[in-house]
């Protein structure tokens, strides 16, 4: 018979021949030939892998490193990496969670909505027209652009979600 | 290394003053944004109050406001919280903070004790 060119979900092909991939939680020491099985080997303490595999080596568990205020939400296990949190009051700087911040600040262009607190982080809104911020802060709202009018000035520049309005005296040239 | 250094604490009577001090080193203090946050015997962290970069923007909690003054020297690398009109809630050790707020860059804090 022909030799395979593709195989079934949950196989592998090497030197022309479809081997079992090894279950989550396993690693590969041997490819199956025509004679033997896939030799698979449990992963060791702290290790694991989470899919079918042809892995010759496991993932190390994440460390939840408490120097960056993290701490381990759920145990890892053969199958399943370790999933870290951030201690109480504190937040995680991203999905991952591989640091902590006590609350994250709103870029130059946004605002403070809704300042952190031990639950929640901060909200953050982007400076609507008319408003601006310059600063990266987790506290201050957007800023209303400077009226020029109120101080018998006219705007020399336009204001811009990151700045201020620019404002100039009004053109002593009139027709 | 960012180190913040927060002192000044201690125990006073219900009514009395103190002043919390946090002296900043390696970074530019200038600029920075910068909390005073509380943590009170087993309670959460409270965000006490903030300053601006510029020391022109200033927020307070609910439960300091009128009561309680944040203010910065750049020229000392130093932020301060003034603290009158004290109450037993007020215990709680003090920390200082810089943006971006980073676990690893907290000081070891500073403890008030209100009682009389």
């Known amino acids: 018979p022909e030799p395979p060119t593709a195989c079934r979900e949950k196989q592998y092909l090497i030197n022309s021949q479809c081997c079992s991939l090894c279950q989550p939680g396993q690693k590969l020491v041997s490819d199956c030939t025509e004679f033997t099985e896939t030799e698979c080997l449990p992963c060791g303490e702290s290790e694991f892998l989470d899919t079918w595999n042809r892995e010759t080596h496991c993932h190390q568990h994440k460390y939840c490193d408490p120097n960056l205020g993290l701490r381990v939400q759920q145990k890892g296990t053969s199958e399943t990496d370790t999933i870290c949190t951030c201690e109480e009051g504190w937040h995680c700087t991203s999905e991952a969670c591989e640091s902590c911040v006590l609350h994250r600040s709103c870029s130059p262009g946004f605002g403070v909505k809704q300042i952190a607190t031990g639950v929640s982080d901060t909200i953050c809104e982007p400076c609507p027209v008319g408003f601006f911020s310059n600063v990266s802060s987790a506290f201050e709202k957007c800023h209303p652009w400077t009226s020029c009018e109120t101080k018998d000035l006219v705007v020399q520049q336009a204001g811009t979600n990151k700045t201020d309005v620019v404002c100039g005296p009004q053109d002593r040239l009139r027709a | 290394e960012v180190q913040l250094l927060e002192s000044g604490g201690g125990l006073v009577q219900p009514g009395g003053s103190l002043r919390l001090s946090c002296a900043a080193s390696g970074f530019t203090f200038a600029g920075y944004e910068m909390w005073w946050v509380r943590q009170a015997p087993g309670k959460g962290l409270e965000r006490v109050s903030a300053i601006s970069g510029s020391g022109g923007s200033t927020y307070y909690a609910d439960s300091v406001k009128g009561r309680f003054t944040i203010s910065r020297d750049d020229s000392k690398n130093t932020l301060y919280l003034q603290m009158n009109s004290l109450r037993a809630e007020d215990t709680a050790v003090y920390y200082c903070?810089?943006?971006?707020?980073?676990?690893?860059?907290w000081g070891q804090g500073t403890l008030v004790t209100v009682s009389s």
């Open positions: 903070a810089k943006e971006p707020y980073s676990f690893d860059s």
